[in-house]
C-alpha cells in the first residue's frame, strides 16, 4: 500500500476579520494509526492550534467527525478570526507511539491571510481658529486595517486637494496597520460653510470608501469690518450714531462705545443676521445727547471678536451747531440693536 500523504489543497486562504476560516486537510490512508495535530508555523517555535487526541481548543471545530473509524478528513474551522491569526498552518499526522506519539507526515501548509476593515476616518483640525488667507493643517487617522495597502484622498467641498502627506504605520510587518495624513488648506472668507473630507479606500470596503469630515466653521475666524455713521437727528438735542459690524464669524462678539475715550456702554452681539456665506452682521446704535457736550465728541465703536484684540472705528460728532442744554447729566442714552427703549 502507498505511504500516507497529508494533503492541504489550499496554498492560501483569505478571510475577513470576524469570520470563520476553514483550513482543509485530508490523509490518503488510514495507516499508520495516530492523531492529527494542527500547528501555526513550523520548527521548534510552532504553535499548537488543535490536537485531535487531547486539549481544549474553544475556537476550533472539526469539519467532519474525527471519531468515525474510516475518517480521512482532518479539516478544521477557526472562529472569530482576527489579524493576529495570520500565518502558515500545518496539518501534521502523528504515528501512535509509546510513550509519545511521533510526528509522521506534514502537509505543505496553508497560508491564512486576514483582511480587516479600517476604522472610520477621524478628521481633526487646528486647536485655534485662523483667519482667511492663512494655511491650516488637518489630520486624518484610521486604524486596524489589513493588508497594508490603502489609499487616502483629501477633498475640500468636493475638490481634491494635493498638498498632503500620508504615512502608514508600522513600516514593517504587523497584524494590522494605521494611516495618518496631514493636509494643508488655505482658508478663504467664504469657508464658513466649507467641509474638508478625508476619504479612505481599502480592499475590504468593496469600492465604497469611508469618509471623515471636518467643518471649516470650527476652524475659521472671519474678522468683522466696522462702519460708524451718524443718523439724522432724532430729537432736537439727540444724535443717533450706528456701528455696522459686518461679515464676522463666529458670532462671539462684544461691542463697546466710547465717548472721548470713556466707556459709555458695552454689549454682546445677540440678535444677528446671517449672510448667505455663513458670516454674520450686527448693528449697534448710540443715542447721544449733544446738549451735554460743550465741545465736539469723538465716538468710538470698539469690537472684540472671538477673544481677539479689539478693533475700533471712530466718528467725530460736531456739537457746535446744536444749542446746549444746561444742567443735563445724561451724555448718552443706552440703546442697542436689541434694546430700543429710551430711558
Amino acid at each position: 500500500e502507498e505511504e500516507l500523504q497529508v494533503i492541504q489543497p489550499d496554498k492560501s486562504v483569505l478571510v475577513a476579520a470576524g469570520e470563520t476560516a476553514t483550513l482543509r486537510c485530508t490523509a490518503t490512508s488510514l495507516i499508520p494509526v495516530g492523531p492529527i495535530q494542527w500547528f501555526r508555523g513550523a520548527g521548534p517555535g510552532r504553535e499548537l492550534i488543535y490536537n485531535q487526541k487531547e486539549g481544549h481548543f474553544p475556537r476550533v471545530t472539526t469539519v467532519s467527525d474525527l471519531t468515525k473509524r474510516n475518517n480521512m478528513d482532518f479539516s478544521i474551522r477557526i472562529g472569530n478570526i482576527t489579524p493576529a491569526d495570520a500565518g502558515t498552518y500545518y496539518c501534521v499526522k502523528f504515528r501512535k507511539g509509546s510513550p509519545d506519539d511521533v510526528e509522521f507526515k506534514s502537509g505543505a501548509g496553508t497560508e491564512l491571510s486576514v483582511r480587516a476593515k479600517p476604522s472610520a476616518p477621524v478628521v481633526s483640525g487646528p486647536a485655534a481658529r485662523a483667519t482667511p488667507q492663512h494655511t491650516v493643517s488637518f489630520t486624518c487617522e484610521s486604524h486596524g486595517f489589513s493588508p497594508r495597502d490603502i489609499t487616502l484622498k483629501w477633498f475640500k467641498n468636493g475638490n481634491e486637494l494635493s498638498d498632503f502627506q500620508t504615512n502608514v504605520d508600522p513600516v514593517g510587518e504587523s497584524v494590522s496597520y494605521s494611516i495618518h495624513s496631514t493636509a494643508k488648506v488655505v482658508l478663504t472668507r467664504e469657508d464658513v460653510h466649507s467641509q474638508v473630507i478625508c476619504e479612505v479606500a481599502h480592499v475590504t470596503l468593496q469600492g465604497d470608501p469611508l469618509r471623515g469630515t471636518a467643518n471649516l466653521s470650527e476652524t475659521i475666524r472671519v474678522p468683522p469690518t466696522l462702519e460708524v455713521t451718524q443718523q439724522p437727528v432724532r430729537a432736537e438735542n439727540q444724535v443717533n450714531v450706528t456701528c455696522q459690524v459686518r461679515k464676522f464669524y463666529p458670532q462671539r462678539l462684544q461691542l463697546t462705545w466710547l465717548e472721548n475715550g470713556n466707556v459709555s456702554r458695552t454689549e454682546t452681539a445677540s440678535t444677528v443676521t446671517e449672510n448667505k456665506d455663513g458670516t454674520y452682521n450686527w448693528m449697534s446704535w448710540l443715542l447721544v445727547n449733544v446738549s451735554a457736550h460743550r465741545d465736539d465728541v469723538k465716538l468710538t465703536c470698539q469690537v472684540e471678536h472671538d477673544g481677539q484684540p479689539a478693533v475700533s472705528k471712530s466718528h467725530d460728532l460736531k456739537v457746535s451747531a446744536h444749542p446746549k442744554e444746561q444742567g443735563s447729566n445724561t451724555a448718552a442714552e443706552n440703546t442697542g440693536s436689541n434694546e430700543r427703549n429710551i430711558y
Epitope: G41, P44, G45, A86, T88, V102, A108
Partner: antibody, heavy 122, light 112 residues
Framework: QVQLQESGPGLVRPSETLSLTCTVS????????WSWIRQPPGKGLEWIGF???????FYNPSLKSRVTISLDMSINQFSLKMTSVTAADTAVYYC????????????????WGQGTTVTVSS | DIVMTQSPLSLPVTPGEPASISCKSS???????????LDWYLQRPGQSPQLLIY???NRASGVPDRFSGSGSGTDFTLKISRVEAEDVGVFYC?????????FGGGTKVEIK
Amino acid sequence: QVQLQESGPGLVRPSETLSLTCTVSGGSIRNYYWSWIRQPPGKGLEWIGFIYYNGRTFYNPSLKSRVTISLDMSINQFSLKMTSVTAADTAVYYCARVRAYSGIGLDGTDVWGQGTTVTVSS
Amino acid sequence: DIVMTQSPLSLPVTPGEPASISCKSSQSLLYSNGYAYLDWYLQRPGQSPQLLIYQGSNRASGVPDRFSGSGSGTDFTLKISRVEAEDVGVFYCMQALQTPLTFGGGTKVEIK
C-alpha cells in the same frame, strides 16, 4: 531579494553589554526564524540563538544566561544583547534567516548578513 | 547537545576532480517524518557562509548541481563532482533537528 544588515559598536569594554541590531529589507519576517551566529577569529561557527516571528526564543545553553534576542516586526529589525562580555566574545557576529516548513526541524539558514566584527577590549 | 564531527580537516583538491567531505552526528538527525535535518554551508574567504544543502540532500536555490548531499541517520556526505576554483573555502555541516543548532568544525578546501 531579502537582505540583512548588522549594525552596532565594533568595540565593547569587558564586563559591558554587547548590543547588535539586524535590519531585514526586501522580504517578510513572518514564518521565519531570525538567528545570531558568531565566529571567533580563525575559528568555526557558533550558534547563539534565534527568535521566531511569533516571539518565541531559543538560546544556546552555553550563552543563555547572558543573551537576549528580541524582534520588532514593525520596523523590520531584530536584536542581540549579550551581557558581561569578555575577550572570549570577540568574534564576527552574523545575523541570518532560518527557514522552517517541514515539521519540527529547520530547513536551512538561507540568508546571512555580511557580519560585523566585535572586539572586546579595554 | 548534538556533536558534529567533520573530516577531513583539510582537503587539497585539483580543479575538475571530485571531492568528498564527511560529517557524523552524535545522534540520528533522521526525524520521524522522514526528513534528515542536516545542512551544508560553504564559507568562501572573507565572506559570509552560504547555504548549499538542506535536509541532507536538497540543493538550495542557485546552488550548482555539482554539489550533492547524501546520508541518513548519523552519517552524511557532501560531494563535489568536479571542483572549481570558486569552491575554495571552509565547508561546514550543521544539524538543524534540535536546539542548540551545532556546527561541525569545518573542512578547509584548497587548490593543490
